[in-house]
């Protein structure tokens, strides 16, 4: 039952190209070197695919023909290694050519950039995209899949080919539209947030699988997958869970071929065994290839069977507890998982790997005791409170959002993690709270049972955000002790952190305050950006300022730019009533 | 390569005892329920018991329940029905399985692997 045993292929170039099929087997090729050499120009990479696509073709006529036989990693790595200006744009990354694989795709893996330094990508007009896209459809879809992945250089390869499906339907239909910009412009716009939101998603995968290995990855996968389909035997699960990891490292390792082959196998297994796995595949297993590999990955929770009986027979009160665990550790506790996620899909993925995590610890202290039942026998009363603790603070933080809204949730978030860790840069303590803020409208509106495993699973996926930035740049040891200590702790260890008292505040800049006409012609959002760019600087100068300290200058701040935005002469306003507000500021606050 | 071999059948009279065992291979045992099914002679085939992967949740049919009792030993991949106060009517040839899935509220029950069956036969 293994979807991925395989007959060994003399050439794996000509297997994959056969396969995926030309189409994709191009569009994944240009992800994977643009995720690899994310300054590269646009019209290099094209060259690099076409000439790697041309070169497939010849194995895939003959595979038996020169350097067919070579592996993936070396016939690409080969190829990235011949753009001639590696070393000046790319520095000491050049210096992985020189190494023999598989060192040589580890080095490139490690010089992946999180946050590359290139420009923000500007919409042009819909009738400017209209006309690229007509011009040339290939070349603007290729376009899109070379911007994407050179940004997001951990993005889920095979979901991008279905977010480009989507795009390209979008230009399809809204470019003969009769108001254009009002069709196309909405779903860019849930494109672009759908697409942060799966490239923050499969971060954390990689991260996981990088920085924890592979049982982790598994656990957390047991935990998702068991909760998902609650019907399916552990058996089952537990083979779901070792294809999608072969996916997921695959993928994440730069393997990007394998990895959209083996989705679509599993996509195809999963399908021709609903029966066994879930009654919600139905309509999933009706979709085309990558729709249905997208609508199984995002579909609901089974019903949970009706006759579960209770976990404690197995895991406490067996006499047999300490010897089912001993003869196979991982299997005894994956079943745990399994039982314990199926019944629980109000649990966050994250919540029942701590339980886990409980359990097996206490095991192992119990099992080496002299009464190992007497021992173990309360082990469930200390899953109380790791259960309160964040469904206390979602409680809390859904009232706080309910109270404030979005923006002003955000800002109380800005606040609370400027704090904590002032020594992160501001762009990422605006990015990491405004994102940590939108778990309000994210999952408030959600009833009890559901808010849990919104909430605390999207905050690990944000929080993991602040740690691939920070890990570019470490500039605090609790950020990187949170980061590296524990990946289902992340939350809780962020949580708990006070303010940072060893922090020396920020020397006031002038500068940092004065704002321009500018500011004026700016979205609501990028308006926002500026002001709670200005608020976490406010924090650093001022790390004691209370909340209603803050408050009032953020109030005058506000007041400020919308006078001023109103004002005949914008610039001499901001001018001369900014001098004002910063001076004011700087008395409210005792600078 | 997946193997499941039963033995312990033969003929018992009314009121007497058996113990079926089913010797599994080529699969991680521990990690799946097993069941025991049986089909007597001109018949469909019936559900018999079945156990979770650890022995501590065991199900019966109606039929059997308070005579059979199904066990297992994971150390040795083996399964077991031990049969009590046997009647005619259980006659027939009994068949160890692997749980693919399993609706114990009476839905969708599916077994990816058998054995080849042990004949009980009951009589005087």
């Known amino acids: 039952r293994g979807v991925f045993r395989r007959d060994a292929h003399k050439s794996e170039v000509a297997h994959r190209f056969k396969d995926l099929g030309e189409e994709n087997f191009k569009a994944l090729v240009l992800i994977a070197f643009a995720q690899y050499l994310q300054q590269c120009p646009f019209e290099d990479h094209v060259k690099l695919v076409n000439e790697v696509t041309e070169f497939a073709k010849t194995c895939v006529a003959d595979e038996s023909a020169e350097n067919c036989d070579k592996s993936l990693h070396t016939l690409f790595g080969d190829k990235l290694c011949t753009v001639a200006t590696l070393r000046e744009t790319y520095g000491e990354m050049a210096d992985c050519c020189a190494k023999q694989e598989p060192e040589r795709n580890e080095c490139f893996l490690q010089h992946k950039d999180d946050n590359p330094n290139l420009p923000r990508l500007v919409r042009p007009e819909v009738d400017v995209m209209c006309t690229a896209f007509h011009d040339n459809e290939e070349t603007f879809l290729k376009k899109y899949l070379y911007e994407i992945a050179r940004r997001h250089p951990y993005f889920y390869a095979p979901e991008l080919l279905f977010f480009a499906k989507r795009y390209k339907a979008a230009f399809t239909e809204c470019c003969q539209a009769a108001d254009k910009a009002a069709c196309l412009l909405p779903k860019l716009d849930e494109l672009r947030d759908e697409g942060k939101a799966s490239s923050a998603k499969q971060r954390l995968k990689c991260a996981s699988l990088q920085k924890f290995g592979e049982r982790a990855f598994k656990a957390w996968a047991v935990a998702r997958l068991s909760q998902r389909f609650p019907k399916a035997e552990f058996a089952e699960v537990s083979k779901l869970v070792t294809d999608l990891t072969k996916v997921h490292t695959e993928c994440c390792h730069g393997d990007l071929l394998e990895c959209a082959d083996d989705r679509a196998d599993l996509a195809k297994y999963i399908c021709e065994n609903q029966d066994s796995i879930s009654s919600k595949l139905k309509e999933c297993c009706e979709k085309p290839l990558l729709e249905k590999s997208h609508c199984i990955a995002e579909v609901e929770n089974d019903e949970m069977p009706a006759d579960l009986p209770s976990l404690a027979a197995d895991f406490v009160e067996s006499k047999d507890v300490c010897k089912n665990y001993a003869e196979a550790k991982d299997v005894f506790l994956g079943m745990f998982l399994y039982e314990y996620a199926r019944r629980h899909p109000d649990y966050s993925v994250v919540l029942l790997l701590r339980l886990a995590k409980t359990y097996e610890t206490t095991l192992e202290k119990c099992c080496a005791a002299a009464d190992p039942h007497e021992c173990y026998a309360k082990v469930f009363d200390e899953f109380k409170p790791l259960v309160e603790e964040p469904q206390n603070l979602i409680k809390q933080n859904c009232e706080l959002f309910e109270q404030l809204g979005e923006y002003k949730f955000q800002n109380a978030l800005l606040v609370r993690y400027t704090k904590k860790v002032p020594q992160v840069s501001t762009p990422t303590l605006v990015e990491v709270s405004r994102n940590l803020g939108k778990v309000g409208s994210k999952c408030c509106k959600h009833p009890e049972a559901k808010r849990m495993p919104c909430a605390e699973d999207y905050l690990s996926v944000v929080l993991n955000q602040l740690c691939v930035l920070h890990e570019k740049t470490p500039v605090s040891d609790r950020v990187t002790k949170c980061c590296t200590e524990s990946l289902v702790n992340r939350r809780p260890c962020f949580s708990a952190l006070e303010v940072d008292e060893t922090y020396v505040p920020k020397e006031f800049n002038a500068e940092t305050f004065t704002f321009h006409a500018d500011i004026c012609t700016l979205s609501e959002k990028e308006r926002q950006i500026k002001k709670q760019t200005a608020l976490v600087e406010l924090v650093k100068h001022k790390p004691k300022a209370t909340k209603e300290q803050l408050k009032a200058v953020m109030d005058d701040f506000a007041a400020f730019v919308e006078k001023c935005c109103k004002a005949d002469d914008k610039e001499t306003c901001f001018a001369e009533e900014g001098k004002k507000l910063v001076a004011a500021s700087q008395a409210a606050l005792g600078l | 390569e997946v193997q499941l071999l039963e033995s312990g059948g033969g003929l018992v009279q009314p009121g007497g005892s058996l113990r079926l065992s089913c010797a599994a291979s080529g699969f991680t045992f521990s990690l799946y329920r097993m069941v025991w099914v049986r089909q007597a002679p001109g018949k469909g085939l019936e559900w018999v018991s079945m156990i979770s992967q650890f022995g501590n949740q065991t199900y019966y049919a109606d039929s059997v329940k308070g005579r059979f009792t199904i066990s297992r030993d994971n150390s040795k991949n083996t399964l077991y029905l031990q049969m009590n106060s046997l009647r005619a009517e259980d006659t027939a040839v009994y068949y160890c399985?692997?749980?693919?899935?399993?609706?114990?509220?009476?839905?969708?029950?599916?077994?990816?692997?058998w054995g080849q069956g042990t004949l009980v036969t009951v009589s005087s």
């Open positions: 399985a692997k749980v693919r899935s399993w609706d114990q509220t009476g839905g969708r029950r599916t077994f990816d692997y």
